[in-house]
């Protein structure tokens, strides 16, 4: 009992501490940590039925999607899927959880963000962190050496997300990957072309795709004097250059990661450079970098890549950026990341900062990690950060006060007089059977005004009105909701007339 009282006091004190920190506007990380402590204390306290007030909410970092948000999401997915299919991709799916062993050692410093599941009868399981590692596992398991596939599914990360910026703990990824032995840089160029096609089609604003190569990074670190064991950790520091100044990055590398200041300065001379193919040419002439085998290979491939990107007509969207050092351990060659240059916002509004909206790269060693003989299957791919894109599209539509239809109903079957429910049911059934998207109000005798109002609200373009006289004449009154114009259509021609007016193909193929 004394222990419970002590815990209750600690919960109270910790609650006061959290409130105090919020009032003092302490750092977000400190508040987050103290809130996490409070939750752990409460968990130890366990339920006290007399006090327990269950707050109905979704777990941290997750959200529900309203019909309006789903409509936006489906439009975005449609653009992406059509592009993937246009490029000849097949589709696969994999389990939402994998054996923990499958995911271990693939994500470097990000491994701490993997969700582990509680005991599942002996198997140690984790929720998938991305779609790439499961894809590599799928290739190795099925002994596939050649596939072009896309996969759209939810992934899970135990992050501390800023949900306002389109970041979550459960979120969709849309991945496109090409696996197989091909001539250099052709699949890589196609991935960048796909990325640009999708981002252009979505009309979310001007974007830039930053490109680098893991081999150039590794070669650069080697000639600057970074020990092999520090490559990955220094990479994660360099990758922060898009968010913080070089000074801060240098301080982290020297102060926290134990790098000598002169080594950091040498790295700084390289990683602060960005440009186009001319920068590639310049670095090929660099007396130190050109002597490094890895860097030389990477630069040679990038030169070739820029040739193909020019042929694809997207070289103006690409920037060779030496600070790009994507955090995942499995990249081996070209890496890329698309960022929005500015996000559309109302005049006088703060632009929505959403960072990276797509990313990817080459990972030639990942499949080999799963193969007992270490056989490699070269792979290159991209991932579209759709959650961030949803946030931008939603914000844009809100700013424009644009009405989004959340259903696809083409026609409402209505009646002008009482006692016509049976006739409405018969007609709506005929329309459904003919492939027409139709609805009716679930009332025996609805008022015509209410039925028309329902169409206005739901954005239904047409109303098929049944009346006593129309039944005798064998016609249906077809009314346009927006123009209010009405025409009598012979019952047998109704399906064809609705399809004509809504632009639907005349046969359901």
């Amino acid at each position: 009992m004394a222990e419970r009282a002590a815990l209750e006091e600690l919960v109270k004190l910790q609650g006061e501490r959290v409130r105090g920190l919020k009032q003092q506007k302490a750092s977000a990380e400190l508040i987050e940590e103290e809130v996490a402590k409070l939750l752990k204390l409460k968990a130890q306290l366990g339920p006290d039925e007399s006090k327990q007030k269950f707050v109905l909410k979704t777990p941290k970092g997750t959200r529900d999607y309203s019909p309006r948000q789903m409509a936006v999401r489906e439009k975005v997915f449609d653009v992406i899927i059509r592009c993937f299919k246009r490029h000849g991709a097949e589709v696969i799916d994999t389990p939402v959880f994998e054996l923990k062993e499958t995911l271990m050692g693939k994500y470097g410093e990000d491994s701490k963000l993997i969700y582990d599941l509680k005991d599942q009868g002996g198997e140690l399981l984790s929720l998938r962190y991305d779609l790439t590692v499961p894809f590599a596992r799928y290739l190795a398991m099925n002994k596939l050496t050649n596939i072009k596939r896309y996969h759209i599914a939810k992934v899970y990360r135990r992050d501390n997300p800023a949900m306002t910026r389109g970041r979550y703990r459960e979120f969709y990824q849309c991945d496109f990957d090409i696996a197989g032995n091909f001539d250099p840089m052709i699949p890589d160029a196609e991935c960048l072309k796909i990325m640009c096609e999708i981002l252009s089609s979505l009309q979310i604003g001007d974007f830039l795709v930053k490109v680098n190569d893991r081999r150039i990074l590794d070669g650069m670190f080697a000639i600057c004097g970074v020990s092999d064991s520090k490559f990955r950790t220094i990479c994660s520091s360099v990758d922060k250059l898009d968010k913080v100044s070089w000074e801060e990055v240098k301080n982290e590398m020297v102060g926290e990661k134990g790098l000598a200041p002169e080594v950091a300065d040498r790295i700084g001379d390289y990683v602060q450079q960005h440009g186009g193919v001319s920068l590639v040419e310049q670095l090929l002439q660099d007396p130190k970098l050109s002597q490094n085998k890895q860097a030389l290979e990477g630069l040679g491939d990038l030169k070739l890549l820029f040739e193909y990107l020019t042929l694809f007509g997207i070289d103006d969207k690409i920037s060779f950026d030496l600070s790009l050092a994507r955090g995942l351990d499995y990249y081996t060659g070209v890496i890329y990341e698309a960022v929005l240059l500015q996000t559309p916002a109302q005049a006088g509004e703060e632009p929505l900062g959403v960072g990276s909206v797509a990313a990817g790269g080459r990972y030639d060693g990942l499949v080999g990690m799963f193969d007992p003989k270490g056989r490699k299957v070269p792979c290159v791919g991209l991932s579209i950060g759709v959650e961030r894109i949803f946030s931008i599209v939603e914000q844009r539509l809100e700013a424009l006060e644009e009405k989004i239809r959340t259903t696809e109903t083409q026609v409402l079957v209505a009646s002008a007089q009482k006692k016509l429910l049976e006739e409405r049911l018969k007609l709506v059934s005929e329309l459904w059977d003919a492939g027409i998207k139709a609805e009716l109000l679930y009332k025996k005798n609805p008022k015509l005004l209410n039925q028309l109002q329902y169409c206005e609200e739901a954005g239904i373009p047409l109303v098929a009105i049944i009346g006593e006289q129309e039944l005798k004449d064998g016609v249906i009154k077809l009314r346009s909701v927006t123009s209010r114009e009405e025409v009598d259509v012979r019952r047998e021609d109704l399906v064809e007339e609705i399809k004509r007016r809504t632009g639907q193909p005349l046969c359901i193929c």
């Epitope: 002590a6 815990l7 006091e9 600690l10 004190l13 006061e16 501490r17 990380e29 940590e33 996490a36 402590k37 752990k40 204390l41 130890q44 701490k112 135990r158 501390n160």
Partner: antibody, heavy 120, light 107 residues
Framework: QVQLVESGGGLVKPGGSLRLSCAAS????????MSWIRQAPGKGLEWVSY????????NYTDSVRGRFTISRDNAKNSLYLQMNSLRAEDTAVYYC?????????????WGQGTLVTVSS | DIQMTQSPSSVSASVGDRVTITCRAS??????LAWFQQKPGKAPKLLIY???NLESGVPSRFSGSGSGTDFTLTISSLQPEDFATYYC?????????FGQGTKLEIK
């Protein structure tokens, strides 16, 4: 019962490195914040560093920040302190300690300590 | 950083005496204060946390009080095993700091 056993101490020259380990048993290690606390010979106690249950949060006292790194391996029930660029003033008995009620910054269980001597 | 100042730095007392040690924080720390006992060559032992809560297994002759900046540890009737050094520690904000210690000696 709760047991914390430190190891890895010893004599090291200034500028050198040492890695301290702490083996934990008798409790669910992965539920607890853990810390390193030191005591220079004949002196008071100094809280050096802490790490949260799943390694999300770490912190260091100013005098060691950038030189020491705290880490843990929950699968092995182990806590570590990597000490680089050691100085004479780092000479102390280093204690591994467990947080009270998992998250309260009060050490309710301590190891026996391991002596680190930095001297040329 | 929050400074913790203990007084007295040493105290001589006899078995059966009532002893009070005080600890002052350089800024308000609510009730985030703990008291430890340390004997030579041993690790410290937790006596009291959040100013007044007795750690399980600690004799009831030990008690703590205070909040904000001023705190006291009281031993109501000294026993032979109580002769040791006592430290206070603030757990309000990092870096968590200890007092310089109060040595309790036999008179």
């Amino acid at each position: 019962q709760v047991q914390l056993v430190e190891s890895g101490g010893g004599l090291v020259k200034p500028g050198g490195s040492l890695r301290l380990s702490c083996a934990a048993s008798g409790f669910t290690f992965s539920d607890y914040y853990m810390s390193w606390i030191r005591q220079a010979p004949g002196k008071g106690l100094e809280w050096v560093s802490y790490i949260s249950d799943s390694s999300t949060y770490t912190n260091y006292t100013d005098s060691v920040r950038g030189r020491f790194t705290i880490s843990r391996d929950n699968a092995k029930n182990s806590l570590y302190l990597q000490m680089n660029s050691l100085r004479a003033e780092d000479t102390a008995v280093y204690y591994c300690a467990r947080y009270l009620y998992q998250v309260i910054a009060v050490a309710d269980s301590w190891g026996q300590g391991t002596l680190v001597t930095v001297s040329s | 950083d929050i400074q913790m100042t203990q007084s007295p730095s040493s105290v001589s007392a006899s078995v059966g005496d009532r002893v009070t040690i005080t600890c002052r924080a350089s800024q308000g720390i609510s009730s985030w204060l703990a008291w430890f006992q340390q004997k030579p060559g041993k690790a410290p032992k937790l006596l009291i946390y959040v100013a007044s809560n007795l750690e399980s297994g600690v004799p009831s002759r030990f008690s703590g009080s205070g909040s904000g900046t001023d705190f006291t540890l009281t031993i109501s009737s000294l026993q032979p095993e109580d002769f040791a050094t006592y430290y206070c520690q603030q757990a309000n904000s990092f870096p968590y700091t200890f007092g310089q210690g109060t040595k309790l000696e036999i008179k």
